[in-house]
């Protein structure tokens, strides 16, 4: 049942929320697999149901109460299994113990917003979600820009070691549409991840004054 | 039905070493997961360490560095090599183990760890 074969990760919000991924090669397509939370130390266990998200692999996320309430700590210890039904039984096809605060990945920055533009600058801010407020300001974020003509891939990554929730822009093109992300990941963690980018927020440089340098 | 003997506790004075057994026995097909938990009195139950079928091994963080998990496969047994003890690590360790089926779950009666001078 648990084999090599097989590979079972998961991340922990911070918050409420264990998202996990399994793939396993030669799986059974039309098997219904969820996974299982147990946690060492609390009284509750959780489940999700694994849904397909390509040809051999699934997710789910296990809900652990309102997003913003702290459900786990440092110290915790869940055990994660991945069941499938055989028959009226569930066997057990993965299994970790997972360390949630080694295993971190944030939610995406919201309320991305501009402050101030200008022709060759722009001010912009953003807020995280769901974070620890374990994590004080033990934080770093990563942004990027997207000029006219190029690709997300291609965009120079801006590096904030910091928690620092704004940017200021500079060396911008006057009149020009641009797109800006930021993403967010936690100091702490063995295993943690950058969290995914926030959706894009566009915004263009004012025009030169005319009769004026740019 | 799967029966767990949890074997080597004592008392043992600060700084002191200890290793405990765990030798699973009865209808074992297939495991997932062997541990050791451990509650002390009034306080809640917490992993110390495990392994899986494939060899992880994870430690609580309060004993990684001074507790060492090791298996017998031939044995069906596992043991707890626990160094450097300290006052908190006194609890009632339990061996637990789970099955290849969620409805698998078998443990110990336990074994008393007592880290005084």
């Known amino acids: 049942a648990v084999n090599g074969t097989s590979q079972f990760t998961c991340f922990y919000n911070s918050r409420a929320n264990i998202s996990c991924v399994w793939s396993q090669d030669g799986a059974l397509q039309d098997t219904s697999c969820q996974v299982h939370a147990w946690p060492d130390r609390r009284r509750w266990n959780q489940t999700c149901e694994l849904l397909p998200v390509s040809q051999a692999s699934w997710a789910c996320n296990l809900i652990l109460g309102a997003p913003d309430s702290q459900k786990l700590t440092t110290v915790d210890i869940v055990t994660l299994r991945v069941l499938c039904r055989e028959g009226v039984r569930w066997r057990v096809m993965a299994i970790q113990d997972f360390k949630p605060f080694e295993n971190l990945r944030l939610m995406a920055p919201i309320s991305l917003q501009v402050v101030h533009v200008e022709t060759h600058r722009c001010n912009i801010s953003w807020e995280i979600s769901q974070a620890s407020h374990y994590f004080e300001r033990h934080l770093e974020f990563e942004a990027r820009t997207l000029s006219p003509g190029h690709t997300w891939e291609e965009a120079p990554l801006l590096t904030l070691k910091q928690k620092q929730e704004w940017i200021c822009l500079e060396t911008l093109t006057p009149d020009t549409q641009y797109e800006f992300q930021v993403r967010v990941k936690p100091l702490q963690g063995e295993f943690t991840t950058w969290s995914p980018w926030s959706q894009p927020l566009a915004f263009r440089t004012k025009p030169a004054a005319l009769g004026k340098d740019t | 039905q799967v029966q767990l003997q949890e074997s080597g506790g004592g008392l043992v004075q600060p700084g002191g070493s200890l290793t405990l057994s765990c030798v699973a026995s009865g209808s074992i097909l297939e495991m997932s997961r062997m541990a050791w938990y451990r509650q002390a009195p009034g306080k809640q139950r917490e992993l110390v360490a495990s392994i899986t079928s494939i060899g992880s091994k994870v430690y609580a963080d309060s004993v990684k560095g001074r507790f060492t998990l090791s298996r017998d496969n031939t044995k069906n047994t596992i043991y707890l090599q626990m160094n450097s003890l300290k006052p908190e690590d006194t609890a009632v360790y339990r061996c637990?183990?789970?099955?290849?089926?969620?409805?698998?779950?078998?443990w110990g009666q336990g074994t008393l760890v007592t880290v005084s001078s």
């Open positions: 637990n183990l789970l099955g290849t089926w969620s409805d698998e779950t078998y």
